[in-house]
């Protein structure tokens, strides 16, 4: 003991009371209040334990410290007062932090930040979906553009060339960002142009499977181009590729006029007001793609006529000749709008095709590709009429949008009856 009558053997975290006794410091406790032997110890009191009288208040957490405690705002909350720590509920000024507007979030650029009470979540942008195996609405959610996700090889078709094409498309989709829409569109069309110029083992598939592949390519291309073109800036774009594929696109904000897209072998005219779906805030897009290479895959594709047209043709012609499928005279073109509801246009669209010469006494038909339930399809004429045809050009008018072409059907046109000609 020292000269001042204070015990020198007091355990850690205690102070002497007198020469023979010690007491634990505030925030520590021992078995008995007064310590009379150096064998006793002072243990930290956990003020944050459930039975404790400490109350930090809402949106806060109690942190035990050596000999004391601190109240701090819970993650996702911050003190209005600016004081990082406090001691009781009356000093609590914790309120929710909006991580989204304050930029304190770590959402991927493919997602949108949503503030929640005390936290935030990252949701896929509209038209995007979570990457394979990653849940939506998490802090680490990463998404991909759905524009590409459905454009995968058609089931049951085994082609190494087609597989390579779709791997390239999926790679483009994986790396896609809205600012790259222009490049991505061009890359997809280049890949398609290359595929159709060099179809490889696609040409060894049975004809029906080739038609299914063509149907799948046309359908997917239209969806992808529609999705991507909404991210383009206003104006007119024209791209052409070595094997003859061509794209014309016009993007506008608010317009009330007709639009004409011109290409090497096709011209399309329609009203702008068809392009926009009511309530859709995005830009209006009108697009036309010429795909001459698609003709290879659509060789010998069937033509299905509606009964009335069939009857009319049989009245004016001797009937379909036995040598089979109609001949594709023109490039296959695909027309699309930002509005995907194009099955019944309020005013018709007009196409002018340049094409190979028509063989005399054959019937020229304006047709569209009708996608069948089985994923394949056939040529059809419903909603399309042939306005006029010359040797190497044909004007078509249609009340819907799809993929179009001019066919030459093997009908034997009757010789004119001179008596009827005189009467006429």
């Amino acid at each position: 003991q020292d000269s001042r009558g204070c015990a020198r053997w007091c355990p850690q975290d205690s102070s002497c009371v007198n020469a023979t006794a010690c007491r634990c410091n505030p925030g520590f406790s021992s078995f008995s209040e007064i310590i009379t032997t150096p064998m006793e110890t002072c243990d930290d009191i956990n003020e944050c334990a459930t039975l404790s009288k400490v109350s930090c208040g809402k949106f806060s957490d109690c942190w035990n410290t050596e000999g004391s405690y601190d109240c701090v705002c819970s993650p996702g909350y911050e003190p209005v007062s600016g004081a990082k720590t406090f001691k009781n509920e009356s000093e609590n000024t914790c309120q929710d932090v909006d991580e989204c507007s304050s930029g304190q979030h770590q959402c991927d650029s493919s997602t949108v930040c949503f503030n929640t009470v005390g936290s935030y979540s990252c949701r896929c942008r509209p038209g995007w979906k979570p990457r394979h195996g990653i849940p939506n609405n998490q802090k680490d959610t990463v998404c991909e553009d759905m524009t590409f996700s459905t454009w995968t090889p058609p089931p049951g078709v085994h082609s190494q060339t087609l597989s390579r094409f779709f791997d390239k498309v999926q790679d483009l989709g994986r790396d896609y960002k809205p600012g790259l829409a222009n490049n991505t569109i061009q890359s997809i069309l280049q890949a398609l142009d290359e595929l159709l110029e060099a179809p490889g083992d696609l040409e060894t598939l049975p004809r029906l499977q080739q038609h299914c592949v063509a149907s799948h390519l046309l359908d997917g291309l239209e969806d992808v181009l529609r999705g991507l073109s909404k991210n383009l800036s206003n104006g007119l774009l024209n791209f052409s590729y070595p094997a003859g594929t061509e794209l014309s696109l016009e993007v506008q904000k608010q317009v009330d006029r007709s639009v004409t897209l011109r290409q090497n072998q096709a011209v399309m005219q329609l009203d702008w007001n068809q392009a926009q779906k009511s309530g859709d805030p995005g830009p209006s897009v009108v697009g036309l793609v010429s795909i001459p290479g698609m003709g290879k895959l659509l060789a010998e594709a069937p033509l299905v006529l509606e009964p009335e047209k069939q009857m009319l043709l049989h009245e004016t012609h001797q009937g379909l000749l036995q040598d089979g499928s109609p001949i594709l005279l023109s490039d296959v073109i695909s027309a699309f709008l930002s509005n995907n509801d194009t099955q019944n246009l309020s005013s018709p669209v007009t196409f002018t095709f340049s094409h190979r010469s028509v063989i005399p006494r054959q019937k020229v038909l304006c047709v569209f590709w009708e996608h069948g339930q089985n994923g394949c399809g056939h040529w059809a004429t419903t909603g399309c009429s042939t306005i006029g045809t010359r040797d190497t050009s044909t004007i078509c008018r249609c009340t819907h949008l799809s993929s179009f072409a001019v066919l030459m059907a093997h009908y034997d046109v009757q010789e004119e009856d001179p008596v009827l000609t005189v009467i006429t």
Partner: antibody
């Protein structure tokens, strides 16, 4: 800096197995597609296998189909080539390479832009 | 499978020479062809993609062209560092295939 480093090569007896690794840095395997290409001593390049990160699809040369398996572990940022039923004719330097898409205003296309240094596989009794 | 037939298999040239290597595809591959340079004991390096596009960082003396199924790599003025083996590769269809290589040696 983009880098690919192969490992796992060595001497193995005919019929044996090896697993080659291709560790990527400077980019993520989850957002790239990877090829394995081999080169027998004094010979030319032969494509072996490919894995697409986006579709998960895999393709193989006929000479290795059914014996080799390509895979990727995104958490380790590594691609693998599991080689079973090895033959003397599989002796080669094995390279992994990144399949990259180039897109600018005037040119578009694909190519193998980064390659590893290669790892030697010797199949011999 | 698509065969890529490269010619010549080797050639001797001097610094400053114009060198042309050709590659013929057994069927149409469109423009999906790349060219690589490989030096002994090293990995190949990409020179040209999409038949005629120069990869970044590659000197402009290298160029590629296409005529149907024939593809050409041209080195306009051969430099000492260009002595190597060159390979063409088609990327149109699986399996991806390489040409057998052309070795460019010093005359």
């Amino acid at each position: 800096e983009v880098q690919l480093v192969e490992s796992g090569g060595g001497l193995v007896q005919p019929g044996g197995s090896l697993r080659l690794s291709c560790a990527a840095s400077g980019f993520t395997v989850s957002s790239s597609s990877i090829h394995w290409v081999r080169q027998a001593p004094g010979k030319g390049l032969e494509w072996v296998a490919y894995i697409s990160s986006s579709s998960g699809s895999t393709y193989y040369a006929d000479s290795v189909k059914g014996r080799f398996t390509i895979s990727a572990d995104t958490s380790k940022n590594t691609a693998y080539l599991q080689m079973n039923s090895l033959r003397a004719e599989d002796t080669a330097v094995y390279y992994c390479a990144r399949d990259f898409y180039f897109g600018s205003y005037y040119s578009f296309g694909w190519g193998l832009d980064y390659w590893g240094q290669g790892t030697l596989v010797t199949v011999s009794s | 499978d698509i065969q890529m037939t490269q010619s010549p298999s080797s050639l001797s040239a001097s610094v400053g020479d114009r060198v042309t290597i050709t590659c013929r595809a057994s069927q149409s591959v469109s423009s999906a062809v790349a060219w690589y340079q490989q030096k002994p004991g090293k990995a190949p390096k990409l020179l040209i993609y999409s038949a005629s596009s120069l990869y970044s960082g590659v000197p402009s003396r290298f160029s590629g062209s296409r005529s149907g199924t024939d593809f050409t790599l041209t080195i306009s003025s051969l430099q000492p560092e260009d002595f190597a083996t060159y390979y063409c590769q088609q990327d149109s269809s699986y399996p991806i295939t390489f040409g057998q290589g052309t070795k460019v040696e010093i005359k």
